[in-house]
């Protein structure tokens, strides 16, 4: 069986301030079992944007039904974008465990923020 891939199709996305940004991510397999998390930036200082398993992320909604047992689409929408949201976003698959361990990351999508149209 093919090893799971994390597909972030868009290298970059540009959104006007105040609008919502859709960041696309799909995985190619249901195995291994474990949650998806979204981060802004890479490395130890990366910022958690969304955790499928737990947490409260008021500006983030999932594009499809991520609770569905066989869901492989983990795209998210971030509302009310501001210039402070600019950066590279990574969709990361974790393997279930105690604790969950990082399994594979997507290639990243760079979000740039345009000035609000007057």
């Amino acid at each position: 069986e093919e090893e799971l891939q994390v597909i972030q199709p868009d290298k970059s996305v540009s959104v006007a301030a105040g609008e919502s940004a859709i960041l696309h991510c799909t995985v190619t397999s249901l195995i291994p079992v474990g949650p998806i998390q979204w981060f802004r930036g890479a490395g130890p200082a990366r910022e958690l944007i969304y955790n499928q398993k737990e947490g409260h992320f008021p500006r983030v909604t999932t594009v499809s039904e991520s609770t569905k047992r066989e869901n492989m689409d983990f795209s998210i929408s971030i509302s009310n974008i501001t210039p402070a949201d600019a950066g590279t976003y990574y969709c990361v698959k974790f393997r279930k465990g105690s604790p969950d361990t990082e399994f594979k990351s997507g290639a990243g999508t760079e979000l740039s923020v345009r000035a609000k149209p007057s």
């Epitope: 891939q5 597909i7 972030q8 199709p9 868009d10 290298k11 995985v27 290639a107 990243g108």
Partner: antibody, heavy 119, light 103 residues
Framework: DVQLVESGGGVVRPGESLRLSCEAS????????MTWVRQAPGEGLEWVST????????YYADSVKGRFTISRDNSKNSLYLQMNSLRADDTAIYYC????????????WGLGTLVTVSS | ALTQPASVSANLGGTVEITCSGG????YGWYQQKSPGSAPVTLI????NRPSNIPSRFSGSTSGSTTTLTITGVQAEDEAVYYC?????????FGAGTTLTVL
Amino acid sequence: DVQLVESGGGVVRPGESLRLSCEASGFTFRNYYMTWVRQAPGEGLEWVSTISDTGDTAYYADSVKGRFTISRDNSKNSLYLQMNSLRADDTAIYYCAKSWIWWTFFDYWGLGTLVTVSS
Amino acid sequence: ALTQPASVSANLGGTVEITCSGGNSNHYGWYQQKSPGSAPVTLIYADTNRPSNIPSRFSGSTSGSTTTLTITGVQAEDEAVYYCGGSSTGDGIFGAGTTLTVL
């Protein structure tokens, strides 16, 4: 075996309408995004439109936006393309394609149906 | 836009690489069309994945903004037009096509 069979092509005049159909078999149609791709005579492949598995989200190329409408009937395993205000540059073979996990990748294609727009 | 060479040639039994670059895609696919108007066939999707009905002589790889289709042990029946495809709709999805001539 996956099969995609297009129909509905033909010769029409500029400004007229046409509805293409694609009948799918050999896979669980309702689980997959579906796409129309076209190829004008002597030209390369051009993405036209994609529809989500449930049918609630559609994507269009700028060249057809506002004129073409993609739809599907999961109970009939069928995909459609309603083409209005047809122009000469819409003349092409229209292929129906099954999208893989990410919707701009295609794993199976139909044989195509020819649309000719001419006065 | 996705950029690929208009034509390449290869010796029978040899190896050929077709490259494609540019656009706003993180991932790529490859499609073969044996004659104009015939149905395209998917060779590679998501960079490296090959459908089960495609011979193992076709392989794909991606590095940065460039994806490469490699045909190892080129056969006469591989003479065709090869299109790369991107994963982002901003690319228009397809390159202009590369014609492979088998010598």
